[in-house]
Interface confidence: medium
């Protein structure tokens, strides 16, 4: 029975009705409502917001809305013992201290419970020592320091600028280099766009602004005390010493006013090249230690934060499918924020709220989607994607059997230049077709499609006339669904012009200045970009839940598999002698990709021709499409990363935010020339090629004719 028979509305009309119901004014109103006080994970305020959302989703018309709670490890500063960094003289006297809080933005002076800047999950400690400036603290920055400049970070406190890579990777790299503490700071080169004023007069970061954030290296584990299993009341919890991903050295973030005071005294080596210089009026000397007159002075960290098992709450709303209620399309985004969450996450949560309202309106008029839609307001994303991961762990058996797709809905904007999409190749055609139907909100593209403005402003590097769509990495709530469970996933938001704005993220990210006013005054006064993002996210969910044949094109996977195989082969070919010596061949991988391409092509032909009125055959074909993403999952996971199980994509081992293709082979090849046992190292490369080839071939076979 078609999902549209009940109302006699054509599917196209349904989609139009859904999109027309989305209103910019509502998103604006919801954003205001969600951003008036902080909603830090684990706090009463965030619990109250969960209950409010539950109540409103019920009013909007969802079939059921439940709270799902977990007791997870969170981290908070000590209220009576603040964290700070000082410069001490030879007598141990503190001659400079970093600020204890950010100056509150206008209108927010009397707001209580603003958590001061801190690095979540930093251990306690008061290390003191000489400073070493390590640029962005990337893998390549430490290679430059240790291998080229012969600078030893062992026993030093390192200072690194935010940007380029996930902060947890910076801390991990510093730990591996032997550092005893890490200071993270926002350099104006990365967080102050030229020609724009600082908040409250513009969207740039003021000198007292600081980026909060967790510094975990969870690799998809979720709650550090219950990896692999939900943190329910009868969970077996590890002790802190055995917890997953916790940093072992104190870490603290500061703004660029305070960073100036630390960096201006730096001595030792000059920066190796201009890429190590930011925009402060300091020499960007690497150190170690301070120069000349200040050489007896040291830096001391004072970190007193505590890790606490705390209750968190997800809100899970259900709109039951009329035809295939056991097939789930999930729209999820987080609710918890570091402070007000003006952009992250509430610009996304407001969009989800409006999407729920629109779906609810259609449902009240008698319509139902073909498949079940689940809506989620995740908690504790900022503390390591904990809410989404715990829920997925609790429901993994249902999800792996019934999960069609997951659409992520964190920040709707990180700029107002053009669309940005990261998704599985299965969704490329869905995204292309949808954006061709939507109007562009961009100035100069009046009357043009979103596809057109997006393609013009962000062209694909490989295919002319098409927009760029990126690989999924991590750092957001799709991680468990895609990287662990193999559920087709995607995300969309409006972004900046990466060509002209080289700063990392948006300047006020995770600071107290991320307010409603930031969005309403500077980013999207008409909320037209928010509306466009709502149309893209909501439209994707609508199509995934309502189209008779799932809108997945397996041929697009074939295309990227070939591209990724070519790429990893060319990396390996930088070592032609070793490949010969150790008989390393990519033939099996290329053969598997070829087979996949041919089988995918034949499957697509069958998809055009089969009898869609036969529910059994329809379900069979849809199941082959649904389970294709699942077929790329290796139950054993990647080496040392058991919860990253997707063989084609994983978060980069050097930057959680970035996606890496054929990650098992990539990591086996990385820095292979420095491995002490080359025979063993190249053996691992061969093993990873075998795993990848087998997986691609096995996935191809899931698309073969069933009998």
């Amino acid at each position: 029975k078609s999902s549209n028979e009940a109302t006699n509305i054509t599917p196209k009309h349904n989609m139009k009705a859904f999109l027309d119901e989305l209103k910019a004014e509502n998103i604006k109103k919801f954003l205001y409502n969600f951003t008036q006080i902080p909603h830090l994970a684990g706090t009463e305020q965030n619990f109250q917001l969960a209950k409010q959302i539950q109540s409103q989703w019920k009013e909007f018309g969802l079939d059921s809305v439940e709270l799902a709670h977990y007791d997870v490890l969170l981290s908070y500063p000590n209220k009576t013992h603040p964290n700070y960094i000082s410069i001490i003289n030879e007598d141990g006297n503190e001659i400079f201290n970093t600020s204890l809080f950010e100056p509150p933005p206008p209108g927010y002076e009397n707001v209580s419970d603003i958590v001061p800047p801190f690095s979540a999950f930093s251990p306690q400690g008061m290390p003191e020592g000489d400073l070493v400036y390590v640029n962005y603290a990337r893998t390549e920055d430490f290679f430059k320091l240790e291998r080229d400049m012969k600078i030893n970070c062992s026993g030093k406190i390192v200072i690194a600028r935010y940007g380029k890579v996930f902060r947890g990777n910076k801390v991990k790299n510093a730990q591996l280099a032997g550092a005893k503490g890490v200071i993270l700071y926002s350099d104006p080169a990365d967080y102050f766009a030229p020609g724009v004023k600082s908040y409250p007069d513009g969207w740039n970061l003021p000198g007292g602004g600081v980026q909060r954030g967790n510094i975990l290296n969870l690799n998809g584990a979720g709650d550090p005390l219950t990896p692999g299993y939900p943190a329910n009341e009868y969970a077996y919890r590890r002790g802190i010493a055995e917890a997953v991903g916790l940093p072992s050295i104190p870490v603290h973030p500061i703004g660029y006013y305070d960073a100036q005071k630390l960096l201006e005294k730096m001595g030792g080596s000059a920066p190796p090249d201009s890429s190590w210089r930011g925009s402060l009026k300091v020499p960007y000397n690497v150190g170690p230690g301070f120069t000349g007159n200040f050489s007896t002075q040291k830096v001391k960290m004072h970190i007193h934060s505590t890790n606490e098992v705390t209750r968190i709450y997800n809100v899970i709303g259900t709109l039951r499918g009329a035809v295939e209620p056991d097939r789930y399309v999930i729209l999820g985004g987080h609710r918890d924020s570091w402070v007000f969450g003006g952009i992250d996450p509430q610009s996304g949560a407001a969009v989800v709220h409006e999407i729920v309202r629109s779906f609810g309106t259609l449902k009240k008029e008698g319509w139902r989607p073909r498949r079940t839609i689940l809506f989620a307001s995740w908690d504790a994303e900022e503390f390591g994607l904990l809410g989404s991961t715990e829920w997925a762990e609790e429901n993994s058996r249902l999800l792996q059997e019934r999960g069609v797709a997951y659409i992520n809905a964190d920040s709707s904007i990180e700029g107002n230049y053009t669309l940005r999409v990261d998704c599985t190749p299965l969704m490329y055609s869905l995204v292309h077709n949808l954006t061709k139907e939507l109007k562009s909100p961009d100035e100069g593209f009046e009357g043009k499609s979103l596809y057109e403005s997006w393609t013009k402003k962000s062209p694909s590097p490989e295919f002319s006339g098409m927009p760029r769509i990126s690989k999924l990495g991590s750092g957001n709530d799709f991680e468990v669904f895609f990287q662990r469970l193999g559920i087709a996933s995607g995300r969309a938001r409006y972004t900046k012009n990466w060509e002209t704005n080289k700063f990392s993220g948006y300047p006020l990210y995770h600071s107290v200045y991320e307010t409603y006013e930031l969005v309403e005054k500077f980013y999207d006064p008409m909320f037209k970009y928010h509306l466009t993002v709502a149309q893209v996210r909501g439209g994707m969910v609508f199509e995934l839940a309502n189209s008779i044949v799932l809108p997945f094109d397996c041929r697009d996977y074939a295309v990227v598999l070939r591209k990724y195989a070519d790429k990893i082969y060319s990396i390996s070919m930088k070592h032609p002698q070793e490949m010969k010596t150790y008989s390393v061949s990519f033939d099996s991988l290329f053969s598997a990709v070829k087979n996949f391409t041919e089988i995918a092509s034949k499957f697509s032909e069958r998809l055009q021709d089969f009898d869609k009125s036969n529910p059994i055959v329809l379900r069979m074909m849809n199941d082959q499409l649904m389970f294709l993403e699942r077929a790329f999952i290796d139950p054993l996971g990647l080496p040392d990363r058991p919860f990253y199980r997707h063989v084609i994509y994983a978060p980069s081992s050097h930057n959680k935010y970035a996606g890496e293709s054929f990650p098992g082979i990539y990591d086996a090849l990385f820095d292979i020339e420095s491995k002490v046992d080359p025979s063993k190292a190249w053996g691992e490369v061969k093993r990873q090629i075998y795993v990848a080839a087998f997986t691609v071939q096995a996935a191809a076979e899931t698309l073969s004719e069933v009998a």
């Epitope: 709670h69 009341e233 009868y234 919890r237 209750r311």
Partner: antibody
Framework: VKLQESGPGLVAPSQSLSITCTVS????????VSWIRQPPGKGLEWLGV???????YYNSPLKSRLSINKDNSKSQVFLKMNSLQTDDSAMYYC??????????WGQGTSVTVSS | TVLTQSPAIMSASPGEKVTMTCRAS???????LHWYQQKSSASPKLWIY???NLASGVPARFSGSGSGTSYSLTISSLEAEDAATYYC?????????FGAGTKLELK
């Protein structure tokens, strides 16, 4: 947060014991409830727990005689223990269970097993 | 895991510093070792949780410390209202277990 136990006071040997714990200030769908007993002049013995999702755990020596149930809508938790002997005489407490601690306790109900 | 508290009974004068110990038969995570206070004919109260965190309303003269198999509760300056029995409790997998208690009396 309040927890209030109510029980029979006196139970004959070999008979069964039923105690009700009525809670307020929190929901049984959010928190588990543990049962603990304390014989006169002795220490505390943890009997078992019913978690928010209805799952239970019973302390091994009592497992065969003990059952814990609840009614979320009435905010009540029920402890039932069979085949009572004189050494089951004790003060019986219910307490809110929160990550391996009991953070709020009832005032207790005294149970004497005697013929 | 068996918890052994010592001493079983102790007496001290007001103003004195008092320390009682709780030893575990096998290692317990400091996150999962807690203390309760029970005054005569009253129900127990959570007093110190996760080794060193004072429960709401507990005076600052109380402190807790320890790791592995050895934990302690200390009162920096004893007051009359502190006379009570103190129980330690642990989790290292169910069931939860209590120590036999330390009875603290005033001299």
């Amino acid at each position: 947060v309040k927890l209030q136990e109510s029980g029979p006071g006196l139970v004959a040997p070999s008979q069964s014991l039923s105690i009700t714990c009525t809670v307020s200030g929190f929901s049984l769908t959010d928190y588990g409830v543990s049962w603990i007993r304390q014989p006169p002049g002795k220490g505390l013995e943890w009997l078992g727990v019913i978690w928010s999702d209805g799952n239970t755990y019973y302390n091994s020596p009592l497992k065969s005689r003990l059952s814990i149930n609840k009614d979320n809508s009435k905010s009540q938790v029920f402890l039932k223990m069979n085949s009572l002997q004189t050494d089951d005489s004790a003060m019986y407490y219910c307490a809110r269970h929160k990550v391996y601690t009991m953070d709020y306790w009832g005032q207790g109900t005294s149970v004497t097993v005697s013929s | 895991t068996v918890l052994t508290q010592s001493p079983a009974i102790m007496s001290a004068s007001p103003g004195e510093k008092v320390t009682m110990t709780c030893r575990a038969s096998s290692s317990v995570s400091s996150s999962y070792l807690h203390w309760y206070q029970q005054k005569s004919s009253a129900s127990p109260k959570l007093w110190i949780y996760r080794t060193s965190n004072l429960a709401s309303g507990v005076p600052a003269r109380f402190s807790g410390s320890g790791s592995g198999t050895s934990y302690s509760l200390t009162i920096s300056s004893l007051e009359a209202e502190d006379a009570a029995t103190y129980y330690c409790q642990q989790y290292s997998g169910y069931p939860l277990t209590f120590g036999a208690g330390t009875k603290l009396e005033l001299k």
